[in-house]
Each structure stands twice: as structure tokens, then as C-alpha cells.
């Protein structure tokens, strides 16, 4: 039976995809055949074949970036170290271990789902401008996050969510494979508006919130505060 596991990694970090026999297991390098590949596309990630130190069949995206330890293999640990994780690594990986002395019997089969995450930048909310006499427009920008974010606009007066019909979100996949988001909010002009833009990263359970206030008395200052709330908020930046 194939074991199933999940692991999470930040973009740019190193991650271990676990594939190991029970403690106390012992293997010989000249007896085990180990294959790591992606489950869907069957891309060759790395492998160990006795008496073959060449890894010429490894896909170029993983060469010198996906490695197993011979020392670990002797102890039944066929885990994969994936260095410098990228968003493109978010997929299912399959580890298969066979023993030659057991007639190429399957010793271990593990499927590891890798979830990749990256922190979005602290949102920047542009100063409001008036396309018309009775309307205000705010723009909120946040970049270099993963996975695709959710964007919410908040009425800071009572912390209520504004109607999503009032916002227009554009999400770009940038050159690094990370997401940039621009959200434009259009609301009716009122004497004093205190709103916030919230970028939610579901995988990291992280909300980044930035406030913007309009009125006769706008004293702008920056501050970043830790502000955990029920939505799992970890970092909040408030401008008021």
C-alpha cells in the first residue's frame, strides 16, 4: 500500500519529503533501487540504482536540487531533500523502493504532496482619488505571494466586510511564479472614510491588513502590529 503524506514549504527554503522504513531497518546500496518522480507527469526527480552514479535521466528542473543521502539509505531513510523550493514544485511526489535480493519486491511506496507558500508583501493602499463627485477609488497592491490570495476590503469603523461587488481584483502570475494582486475599490463618497485592505494567504493562515483614512483630519503614520484575530490574522499593518 502507498502511504500518503503532506508537507508545506516556503518558497526559497529547503524541504524534506519523507520516505522512510521503520527505525532499525538496514539496507545495502548495492541492493536497493530507489525512484522519486512526480505522480502526475512522471517527471524523474532523482533515483538510486546500484553501481550507477550517473543521474543523467533526472529532469533538468531537479538536477542538483533534489537529493537523497546514501547514509540515510543504509538506515532505511530514502527521504528526498529538495533545495530552493519554487512554486512549480507544488505537486505530488512518489517514492518507490525496491529490493533486488527480494526479487525486486516493493519495500516502500510513499506519495508526498508538497504545498508551497510565500508571504505576500505588506499591502500598499494608494491615497483615495475621486473619478467623480460622488465616488472614491482606493487601490491596494501586494506582491510576491503564493498561493493565489483572497482580497477583502474592511470598514475599519466597525470591522465589517465591504461588499465584494464594490471591488475589482486583478491577479498576475509574475516572472518568479509568484502572485501579484491589485484590487480597486469604488465606494460612495462620505465625509470620513476609514477602510482597510486585507490580503489573505489561506495556506499560511495569514492576513495582512493595511488601513487608509480620509477626512478633514488625516494624520498619516505607519505602524506594523501583531494583531491576531479570529480569521487567523498573524501580521497586520495599520495606517491611520
Amino acid at each position: 500500500d502507498t502511504q500518503e503524506k503532506e508537507v508545506r514549504a516556503m518558497v526559497g527554503s529547503d524541504v524534506e519529503l519523507s520516505c522512510a522504513c521503520p527505525e532499525g531497518s538496514r539496507f545495502d546500496l548495492n541492493d536497493v533501487y530507489v525512484y522519486w518522480q512526480t505522480s502526475e507527469s512522471k517527471t524523474v526527480v532523482t533515483y538510486h540504482i546500484p553501481q550507477n552514479s550517473s543521474l543523467e535521466n533526472v529532469d533538468s528542473r531537479y538536477r542538483n536540487r533534489a537529493l537523497m543521502s546514501p547514509a540515510g539509505m543504509l538506515r532505511g531513510d530514502f527521504s528526498l531533500r529538495l533545495f530552493n523550493v519554487t512554486p512549480q514544485d507544488e505537486q505530488k511526489f512518489h517514492c518507490l523502493v525496491l529490493s533486488q535480493s527480494l526479487g525486486f519486491q516493493e519495500v516502500l511506496s510513499v506519495e508526498v504532496t508538497l504545498h508551497v507558500a510565500a508571504n505576500f508583501s505588506v499591502p500598499v493602499v494608494s491615497a483615495p482619488h475621486s473619478p467623480s463627485q460622488d465616488e472614491l477609488t482606493f487601490t491596494c497592491t501586494s506582491i510576491n505571494g503564493y498561493p493565489r490570495p483572497n482580497v477583502y476590503w474592511i470598514n475599519k469603523t466597525d470591522n465589517s466586510l465591504l461588499d465584494q461587488a464594490l471591488q475589482n481584483d486583478t491577479v498576475f502570475l509574475n516572472m518568479r511564479g509568484l502572485y501579484d494582486v491589485v484590487s480597486v475599490l469604488r465606494i460612495a463618497r462620505t465625509p470620513s472614510v476609514n477602510i482597510g485592505c486585507c490580503i489573505e494567504n489561506v495556506l499560511l493562515q495569514q492576513n495582512l491588513t493595511v488601513g487608509s483614512q480620509t477626512g478633514n483630519d488625516i494624520g498619516e503614520r505607519d505602524k506594523i502590529t501583531e494583531n491576531p484575530v479570529s480569521t487567523g490574522e498573524k501580521n497586520a499593518a495599520t495606517w491611520s
Epitope: 524534506e16 543521502s69 543504509l74 531533500r81
Partner: antibody
Amino acid sequence: QVQLVESGGGVVQPGRSLRLSCAASGFTFSSYGMHWVRQAPGKGLEWVAVIWYDGSKKYYADSVEGRFTISRDNSKNTLYLQMNSLRAEDTAVFYCARDLNIMVWGIFDYWGQGTLVTVSS
Amino acid sequence: EIVLTQSPATLSLSPGERATLSCRASQSVSSYLAWYQQKPGQAPRLLIYDASNRATGIPARFSGSGSGTDFTLTISSLEPEDFAVYYCQQRNNWPWTFGQGTKVEIK
């Protein structure tokens, strides 16, 4: 050039403890697995312990399992070996050695000059 | 545990001569065998790994061959600095083990 310098050896009574250090320079310490290997006087070499490049995994020879602890401080480029419950048969020159590969192949490509540990009452 | 037996225990040769050192494993270690040189009062030095790959900076007169259980280290023409003890080591099985050494001395 790669340099490994061991320290902390000396004479110690059976049952007591000792901590060896190995200061590394001339290479990116945090990118290599590291080992301790020992050599009893006039005898051959015996592998003792290994630690992964990031300290995440450690393995030991059966003869020292449960008594010795290998560790590293990558910010200080230093490898350690904490030796407890020392026995007369632990008397040896202890070498720290660098593994050839980040993922620990069990090939020792650079060695320190060694530090002598004598366990005697 | 794999036992590595080196022969001869001592090899007496003159500078310029060819040295042939043997290492036999108690069971197959494939090609996962290394050779080290150790001079008196010094640390070992890696010469050959995975049976036949010369380590960085090792002169071409050192060569390794063999696979399975029988391995050979050859020094094609002995230089004065080559007189030392030579150890083989396997990494195919747990634990990693060394041979007892072959001493190459000046005849």
C-alpha cells in the same frame, strides 16, 4: 584552504565526560555533512558519528550509541562531540572529518589533525 | 558488519617501484570503496573514492580498481612521500568500516 582543528582532548577517568570541538574554516561549513572518526593507539580507523549539514539527522556507531552526542553550530562553524560514560576502550585520537557531499555519502575528504582522548583511572 | 581485509600487512619496496595493495570485502560492496593514506603523526588523506575516482589534488600515479569484493590500489611509481599506511573503507553497508591497513615501507 580547508582546515579542521580539533580541541578538547585530554586525560579523563572512566565514567566521566568530555566535549570535543572542531573549528572549521576555508569552506562553507553549513553545506557539508560532518563526521567524527577515531583511531586507538597503534590501531586502525573507526567511524564514530555523523551529522547532516543542517543538524537535522545524526547517526552513531553501535559502540558509542547512547553515550556520545554529535552536534554542530553553523553560525560558529564548529562541530562538537559530547562524550559521556567514557570507557578505557574509548582511548583514541579523535578526528573530525568533512563528508564529500552535502547529503552525506560516507566519504571523508578532509580531516583534522586529531585530538587525543585518554580514558584512565 | 562488513569486514575488509587488506593484504599484505606490510609491503617493502624501493622508490620508483610499482605498489599493488589489495582490499577484500567479506561480502559485495559494489563499487562503494575508498582508499586513504596516513603518514605517522598525521591525519588520513582521501586518495580514491567509489573504487576508481581520484580525489581532488591526488597525483595520477595513484589509481584504484575493482568491484564487488576485490579491490586494488596501485601506485605506479613510488615517490619518497608515498611511504605510509593505506586504509580501504566501504560505504555500501551500515556501519561504514575500514580495513586494518597496509604499511608501505622503504626496502
